[in-house]
């Protein structure tokens, strides 16, 4: 429970307003009012406050609002979201792009990963999908932060939007992410013709089935060694090494690079020795010639 | 269901000493501001004072000022109106009511306790 | 303090018209802060509107509010039986708290 002390008159608090930053922590406590501080939120971030001041500002926002801020209150905290935790934002119904733009300028700068992933999934559900606007606001305010949201927000991403994103902005996004992304992509740049499909769907390629890999591969792509080690293992592992010599192009000799890493190391596991002898790049650890190979998944699978 | 229920009206003598009660249920009086707002006979609302649930800040109007006091027990959910020298501008029906943060309006009152200072 | 003053005094109608009633602050308030009650003779307030426009919980759509800055009105569109009654604003963006000195809606 919180320690209660009197407000002395002198010190009563009728504006928030720069003298407030002489006041100390238990003076701020006993005569700053929650509602008179919410209701005047918009003159708070001009206040130099001490980061101890903050955290006291804080919890009269916490008292006044344990159900979670109202954006009126959210869209002027200033440097005071730097004091929130994701358990705070997680409360919080955000719908104005005003508002997230706001809070993302003053995030910069700071370890704030974790409340910036929340804020975005808060906006998100808040305006119902990530709309064009919304994917807009996090490309020119937040590179990167598309890969934020979990892949069930991604999943109302509608294909429409797809375009406008950058291959920056999927630089942080694991295979889930992309899993739920590459789909769209596909549908969005379908029309496309093969050198210019290739350019746009790369970035999401992380999310690609084993079928349009070996689609790709027909399409004399000349897949850069960057994108390959992005795609799912399970999606390059079914490649026969003819398929990844096309598929590479050029850039196949970088598979000896690469060779201890995943996914070329699993790839070259499951390849015959003689078959990647024809590389002539001298990968070794393939299946030596003569021996049989067993995929024992299938047998268990219909067993 | 919300309910309050105030307490501790009377008759009571210029300078003399009243204390109200307003019992809470139906709600996280905890995590509630509540108000106190008088009426006198024949005349409008008057805002007299509020709580905050947590640190207990109070504000008051500045015709109450230094004489009454409004406090709470959170253990109790209770609210209380301590007010002193009374004099006979003080009559008047006192409500307790609870103050609504997110609509930012007074949302629930009590019935209301008539305070009668007179000699 | 912020001082607001209502208007008309009283307001004589019959049921099924129009009621509009006023309410002026000394200083802009913003919107979010501006509460409207209803009192009937012998009862404690209750909340009609909050945030100048949005209706509370089980307030018929015939009230109404609007306005911004310094003016805000409250409207009835067409008066029942049970509307006639004393309507007070209320600010809450600086203490104290005030509230006008109410319109009396009456029967004509």
């Known amino acids: 429970d919180v320690e209660r002390t009197t407000c002395p008159p002198e010190k009563e608090v009728h504006e928030i307003d720069e003298s407030l930053i002489f006041y100390k922590k238990r003076e701020l406590e006993a005569c700053v009012d929650a509602a008179l501080l919410a209701a005047q939120m918009d003159r708070v971030d001009a206040i130099p406050f001490t980061y101890e001041q903050l955290d006291v500002l804080k919890h009269k926002l916490d008292e006044l609002y344990p159900q979670g801020y109202p954006e009126s209150v959210i869209r002027h905290l200033g440097h005071l979201f730097l004091k929130m935790s994701p358990e705070d934002i997680r409360k919080w119904n955000v719908t104005s792009l005003e508002t997230l733009k706001a809070l993302l300028k003053v995030s910069k700068g700071h370890e704030m990963s974790a409340q910036v992933a929340t804020l975005i999934d808060r906006v998100v559900v808040g305006r119902g999908q990530l709309d064009k606007d919304t994917a807009d606001t996090l490309t020119a305010f937040c590179p990167g932060c598309l890969c934020s949201l979990s892949p069930e927000r991604l999943s109302s991403v509608p294909p429409s939007i797809i375009g406008a994103v950058r291959p920056q902005d999927l630089d942080t996004c694991g295979p889930r992410q992309l899993d739920v992304l590459y789909p769209k992509a596909r549908l969005a740049f379908q029309n496309m013709s093969g050198s210019e499909y290739f350019v746009k769907i790369r970035p999401f390629l992380g999310g690609a089935p084993t079928e349009d890999l070996k689609a790709l591969s027909q399409q004399n792509v000349s897949m850069d060694l960057a994108t390959f080690m992005k795609l799912r293992r399970e999606a390059v592992l079914p490649l026969s090494v003819a398929e990844v010599q096309k598929l590479l192009g050029p850039h196949v000799e970088g598979l000896k690079v690469e060779e201890q890493h995943s996914p070329v190391r699993d790839w070259i596991l499951k390849q015959r020795q003689d078959d990647l002898d024809t590389l002539g790049l001298g990968l070794q650890g393939g299946i030596p010639n003569g021996y049989l190979i067993l995929d024992l998944s299938v047998r268990e699978a219909l067993s | 269901e919300v309910q309050l229920l105030e307490s501790g009206g009377g008759l009571v003598q210029p300078g003399g000493s009243l204390r109200l009660s307003c019992a809470a249920s139906?709600?996280?009086?905890?995590?509630?501001?509540m108000s106190w707002v008088r009426q006198a006979p024949g005349k409008g609302l008057e805002w007299v004072s509020n709580i905050s649930p947590t640190y207990s800040t109070t504000n008051y109007a500045d015709s109450v000022k230094g004489r009454f006091t409004i406090s709470r027990d959170n253990s109790k959910n209770t609210l209380y109106l301590q007010m002193n020298s009374l004099r006979a501008e003080d009559t008047a029906v006192y409500y307790c009511?609870?103050?609504?943060?997110?609509?930012?309006?007074?949302?629930?009152w009590g019935q209301g306790t008539l305070v009668t200072v007179s000699s | 303090e912020i001082v607001l003053t209502q208007s008309p005094g009283t307001l004589s109608l019959s049921p099924g018209e129009r009621a509009t009633l006023s309410c002026r602050a000394s200083?802009?308030?913003?919107?979010?802060?501006l509460a409207w009650y209803q009192q009937k003779p012998g009862q404690a307030p209750r909340l009609l509107i909050y945030?100048?426009?949005s209706r509370a919980t089980g307030i018929p759509d015939r009230f109404s509010g609007s306005g911004s800055g310094t003016d805000f009105t409250l409207t009835i569109s067409r008066l029942e039986p049970e509307d006639f009654a004393v309507y007070y604003c209320q600010q809450a963006l600086g203490y104290p708290h005030t509230f006008g000195q109410g319109t009396k809606v009456e029967i004509k």
């Open positions: 200083q802009s308030v913003s919107s979010s802060y």
């Open positions: 945030g100048a426009s």
């Open positions: 009511a609870r103050y609504n943060a997110y609509q930012i309006g007074l949302d629930y």
């Open positions: 139906g709600f996280t009086f905890t995590q509630t501001y």
